[in-house]
């Protein structure tokens, strides 16, 4: 339905405070350089002005898209050409060319200090003194870290983030209370971003069909009473969500979101029967709910996919008629029936089952030539099920951390030319998914398991494609999105990487990492590791575990030596000569 | 034109009870939130109370959570605002807004830009 001003609608569906805090979101994720101040005042005028086209709709300029009324805002930004260099060349343009610019240049690793969290009497008086300014800054340094995150999502955390200080800021104990319930936003917050940064990157790299198939797949697992037109239309509605919130249309996104929630829940009899507690809390608990509401339980007596998809003489009629409804059709009714799988692994049988057609529907007996398709599918399950049994084998015998130094080594060897904080990061990550997935029984462990690692590659792939420095991860970034982690398992060492020269630098530690948290620590030694097998990928487990283990050991030594910093010296340089003869260095 | 029409208001004790009610007639468009707004003589107007339709659901300003409740009937286009343990400080006109957002606000705080009806508004005064 067209709108005169599509800023007054917007203003008017969404209310003043989230209209405020969603431009401030889509600002502060374009230009994620820019003071928290410099952001307010541009989202006071932009408001300002949003107020002027409510009260006259047909005021100048409130016939602009939204676009261009923020784009010609940002493009104010008097340090634009110093602070982003090329980006301000987007100022140039015209829309639509000119957000597509911004988008472009959106900075999944951006050049911004870490967030150090103060002390919590520091943060209750400065949450008490002003919390309105307070809550703004915790939505822009969440939205320039992570210029992909969800913005709806956002205003969830937001949401929550304020709850814990009203509650904790009252409380005997304000640390007790408080710090846990940060904890536990942050750990969310990070897995939430991540998560959204692959539909993102579905979308936007491999469409809008790659992300409707997705949809699909795991809709029809989450809904399986759901008829498939129902499932369709939830498919399309969501599909525009995401396409609107990766595209930086925020308030849109927002109000599309919120529109479906309300239609899933006037609907629910027709779509789950385990959305009913979600249905009656409060709109962005509402919509999170909904996102992450269990599946639903298959329906009895579903008669087998044989009979419509390889025994019925109509396939190929029924596929050339229609063929990405009948593809739709094919994985909607193939994962309602498995739970079990991951989506990946049913998009996977989805594609098998479409290059088959294509090839036996032109063949001279089509059906003869489609009729043991099904039989092709079995190495496709399997292979994901003996990946995942082994790695829940080697997690439970090693625990998280040394399952994470095993990673590091597997993929330093595959990708020796990736950048070490970006193997520590995506290592640790991978490894996670032994305490996430590897406690859940049989039937649960694959969807968790490989849609948990397509997640963690994509941070590799967007890590990466910032600055490519492997052709074997381009190549399996880019080539197909649900066969990532297929490609990324069959990468052997990478026997044309030449070694990296031996710094001692690299490996000289002070007494700095005796005051760090058992993570920071952590992280610490499993650099040194990776820099140990850029030296020598050649280098057995037992040699590397030797090293380390030598290494653990001379940090706790020197962590309890009277002067720190003299043993961290003197031992160091032992350490270093003894590595380097164990390693042949 | 959408009127918006309030009453209940009046003269109670400190500690006391009150009920005010609001009736929305004429075009119903938009009509996705009402809420109430109070202010006093020589302050700006605040946010009280407000309910979105689309969810059912209820906000509150800090200052009167726990003591007022708002309540609705969606088809009659009417709402209420019981106002228990009421103290001097509440002493206001108090206006009802129609026409509100479709969405309740992330941070529960509304504001009368958010709104595009008013009442007239009714007095409520509380002595000590």
């Known amino acids: 339905d067209a709108h005169k001003s599509e800023v007054a609608h917007r203003f008017k569906d969404l209310g003043e405070e989230n209209f405020k805090a969603l431009v401030l979101i889509a600002f502060a994720q374009y230009l994620q350089q820019c003071p928290f101040e410099d952001h307010v005042k541009l989202v006071n005028e932009v408001t300002e002005f949003a107020k002027t086209c409510v009260a006259d709709e047909s005021a100048e300029n409130c016939d602009k898209s939204l676009h261009t009324l923020f784009g010609d805002k940002l493009c104010t930004v008097a340090t634009l050409r110093e602070t982003y260099g090329e980006m301000a060349d987007c100022c140039a343009k015209q829309e639509p060319e000119r957000n597509e610019c911004f988008l472009q240049h959106k900075d999944d690793n951006p050049n911004l200090p870490r967030l150090v969290r103060p002390e919590v009497d520091v943060m209750c008086t400065a949450f008490h003194d002003n919390e309105e300014t307070f809550l703004k800054k915790y939505l822009y340094e969440i939205a320039r870290r992570h210029p992909y995150f969800y913005a709806p999502e956002l205003l969830f955390f937001a949401k929550r983030y304020k709850a814990a200080f009203t509650e904790c800021c009252q409380a005997a104990d304000k640390a007790a209370c408080l710090l846990p319930k940060l904890d536990e936003l942050r750990d969310e917050g990070k897995a939430s971003s991540a998560k959204q940064r692959l539909k993102c990157a579905s979308l936007q790299k491999f469409g809008e069909r790659a992300f409707k198939a997705w949809a699909v797949a795991r809709l029809s697992q989450r809904f399986p009473k759901a008829e498939f037109a129902e499932v369709s239309k939830l498919v399309t509605d969501l599909t525009k969500v995401h396409t609107e919130c990766c595209h930086g249309d925020l308030l849109e996104c927002a109000d599309d979101r919120a529109d479906l929630a309300k239609y899933i829940c006037e609907n629910q009899d027709s779509i789950s029967s385990k959305l009913k507690e979600c249905c009656e809390k409060p709109l962005l608990e509402k919509s999170h709910c909904i996102a992450e509401v269990e599946n639903d339980e298959m329906p009895a007596d579903l008669p087998s996919l044989a009979a419509d998809f390889v025994e019925s003489k109509d396939v190929c009629k029924n596929y050339a008629e229609a063929k990405d409804v009948f593809l739709g059709m094919f994985l909607y009714e193939y994962a309602r029936r498995h739970p079990d799988y991951s989506v990946v692994l049913l998009l996977r049988l989805a594609k098998t089952y479409e290059t088959t057609l294509e090839k036996c529907c032109a063949a001279a007996d089509p059906h003869e030539c489609y009729a043991k398709v099904f039989d092709e599918f079995k190495p496709l399950v399997e292979e994901p099920q003996n990946l995942i049994k082994q790695n829940c084998e080697l997690f439970e015998q090693l625990g998280e951390y040394k399952f994470q130094n095993a990673l590091l080594v597997r993929y330093t060897k595959k990708v020796p030319q990736v950048s070490t904080p970006t193997l520590v990061e995506v290592s640790r990550n991978l490894g996670k998914v032994g305490s996430k997935c590897c406690k859940h029984p049989e039937a649960k462990r694959m969807p968790c398991a490989e849609d948990y690692l397509s997640v963690v590659l994509n941070q590799l792939c967007v890590l990466h494609e910032k600055t490519p420095v492997s052709d074997r991860v381009t190549k399996c970034c880019t080539e197909s999105l649900v066969n990532r982690r297929p490609c990324f398992s069959a990468l052997e060492v990478d026997e044309t990487y030449v070694p990296k020269e031996f710094n001692a630098e690299t490996f000289t530690f002070h007494a700095d990492i005796c005051t760090l948290s058992e993570k920071e620590r952590q992280i610490k030694k499993q650099t040194a590791l990776v820099e140990l097998v850029k030296h020598k990928p050649k280098a057995t487990k037992e040699q590397l575990k030797a090293v380390m283990d030598d290494f653990a050991a001379f940090v706790e030594k020197c962590c309890k030596a009277d002067d720190k910093e003299t043993c961290f010296a003197e031992e160091g340089k032992k350490l270093v000569a003894a590595s380097q003869a164990a390693l042949g260095l | 034109e959408l009127q918006v029409v309030e009453s209940g208001g009046g003269l109670v004790q400190a500690g006391g009870s009150l009920r005010l009610s609001c009736a929305a007639s004429?075009?119903?468009?938009?009509?996705?939130?009402m809420g109430w707004f109070r202010q006093a003589p020589g302050k700006e107007r605040e946010f009280v109370a407000a309910?979105?339709?689309?969810?059912?659901?209820?906000y509150y300003a800090d200052s009167v959570k726990g003591r007022f409740a708002i309540s609705g009937d969606n088809a009659k286009n009417t709402v209420y605002l019981q106002m228990n343990s009421l103290k001097p400080e509440d002493t206001a006109v108090y206006y009802c807004?129609?026409?509100?957002?479709?969405?309740?606000?992330?941070?529960?705080?509304?504001?009368?830009?958010?709104?595009?009806?008013w009442g007239q508004g009714t007095q409520v005064t509380v002595s000590s």
């Open positions: 807004a129609a026409e509100g957002p479709k969405w309740e606000p992330w941070n529960g705080i509304a504001h009368p830009a958010d709104f595009g009806s």
């Open positions: 309910i979105t339709w689309s969810g059912g659901t209820t």
């Open positions: 004429g075009r119903t468009f938009r009509s996705n939130t």
